[in-house]
C-alpha cells in the first residue's frame, strides 16, 4: 500500500523483535488467522489472532483522535519514538498525542504476541472459509 510508511511498519516490526528476539514478524505474523495482516473479519481463531484484532481496533480508535489525521487514513504513516531495553518497550514521553496513542497500540500488540501461542495451522488461512461472522 503506497500510503504505508516503511519506517513506521519497521518500527512495529522492531518492537515485536524486542519482545520476541528470535522472531521474523513479517514472515510469521502477516496473513495469520483472521486479523493478522490486511483487514479482518469474523471471530479470531486463537489468542494471537485476537491480539491482532485488538491492534486493529486500537488503530480504529486512533483514527478518531483529532490529532490523528493520517495520510490515506493509515496509522502506519505516523512514526513515533520508543526504546527497547531487554524485552521491555517504553513509548517516549516526547511523543505527541497521536504518536503516543499509536505507539501504545503497537506496544500492547507486541506484548500480546509474546504471550500468545503460535499455531502454524493458522498461517495463511482461507479467510473466506474460516473468518465468517
Amino acid at each position: 500500500d503506497s500510503g504505508i510508511s516503511p519506517r513506521a511498519v519497521w518500527q512495529f516490526r522492531k518492537m515485536i523483535k524486542c519482545v520476541i528476539p528470535g522472531s521474523d514478524p513479517f514472515l510469521e505474523y502477516n496473513n495469520y488467522g483472521c486479523y493478522c495482516g490486511l483487514g479482518g473479519s469474523g471471530t479470531p481463531v486463537d489468542e494471537l489472532d485476537k491480539c491482532c484484532q485488538t491492534h486493529d481496533n486500537c488503530y480504529d480508535q486512533a483514527k478518531k483522535l483529532d490529532s490523528c489525521k493520517f495520510l490515506l487514513d493509515n496509522p502506519y504513516t505516523h512514526t513515533y519514538s520508543y526504546s527497547c531495553s531487554g524485552s521491555a518497550i517504553t513509548c517516549s514521553s516526547k511523543n505527541k498525542e497521536c504518536e503516543a496513542f499509536i505507539c501504545n497500540c503497537d506496544r500492547n500488540a507486541a506484548i500480546c504476541f509474546s504471550k500468545a501461542p503460535y499455531n502454524k495451522a493458522h498461517k495463511n488461512l482461507d479467510t473466506k472459509k474460516y473468518c465468517q461472522s
Partner: antibody
Framework: EVKLQESGPELVKPGASVKISCKVS????????MNWVKQRPGKGLEWIGR????????NYNGKFKGKATLTADKSSSTAYMQLSSLTSEDSAVYFC?????????WGQGTLVTVSA | EIVLTQSPAITSASLGQRVTISCSAT?????VHWYQQKSGTSPKPWIY???RLASGVPARFSGSGSGTSYSLTISTMEAEDAAIYYC?????????FGAGTKLELK
Amino acid sequence: EVKLQESGPELVKPGASVKISCKVSGYAFSSFWMNWVKQRPGKGLEWIGRIYPGDGDINYNGKFKGKATLTADKSSSTAYMQLSSLTSEDSAVYFCVRGWAWFPYWGQGTLVTVSA
Amino acid sequence: EIVLTQSPAITSASLGQRVTISCSATSSVSYVHWYQQKSGTSPKPWIYEISRLASGVPARFSGSGSGTSYSLTISTMEAEDAAIYYCQSWNFPLLSFGAGTKLELK
C-alpha cells in the same frame, strides 16, 4: 432472509439408519459452514460436526465419528445428516445451524425417535 | 477438547433481581458466546464474542470475562428472561457447549 428448513419427524427402529435434511434459502449455501447439533429430551446441546459445502470439508466431534455422516448438495442448497446403527440414545431433536465460530441461524429442529 | 462448565445448573430470581450465570473453560479460550432457549423452540443467539448483544436482545443483558472465566448478567430480571442459557466456545476448529443453566422466575 436466511431460512433453514428441516425435514419432518422420523420414527425409526433400533439398528436402522435415518437421513435428515436441511434446505436453506436467503444466502449463498456454498459459502457458509453448516453445523448439526443434538438435543436429547430435557438435556443440553451437543455439537455433532459441520460441513463446508463449498469444498466438502468436514469437522466432526470425535464422539459422533462413525455415528453421523454429513453431506451437502450444492445444486439444491440442502445439507444432510445420516445417523447409523440407531439406539435409544439417538432419540433427540437435531438442529441444522449456520455458522463457524458461533451460531446466528438455527433450523426448527427434526425430532428423531428410535423405538421398536 | 475444551469442556465448558456452567454454574449454577438451576437458579431462580425475583422480578427486578440481578442475575449472574457463569461459564468456566478447562483451558483459556478467546471467546465465549451465549444462547437462550425456551421450551419447545430452537436456541436463539443471545450474546456473542463475550459481550456483543445479538439483534433484539434487551440492554439489561451483558456479558464479560476472559481466559477461562466468563459470565452472563441480567441487571434486572424480567418474566420473559426465564429460560435455559447455554455458553459455547471453540478451540479451532472444534466447538463445545456448556450443559446449560435453567433460570426460573421466583
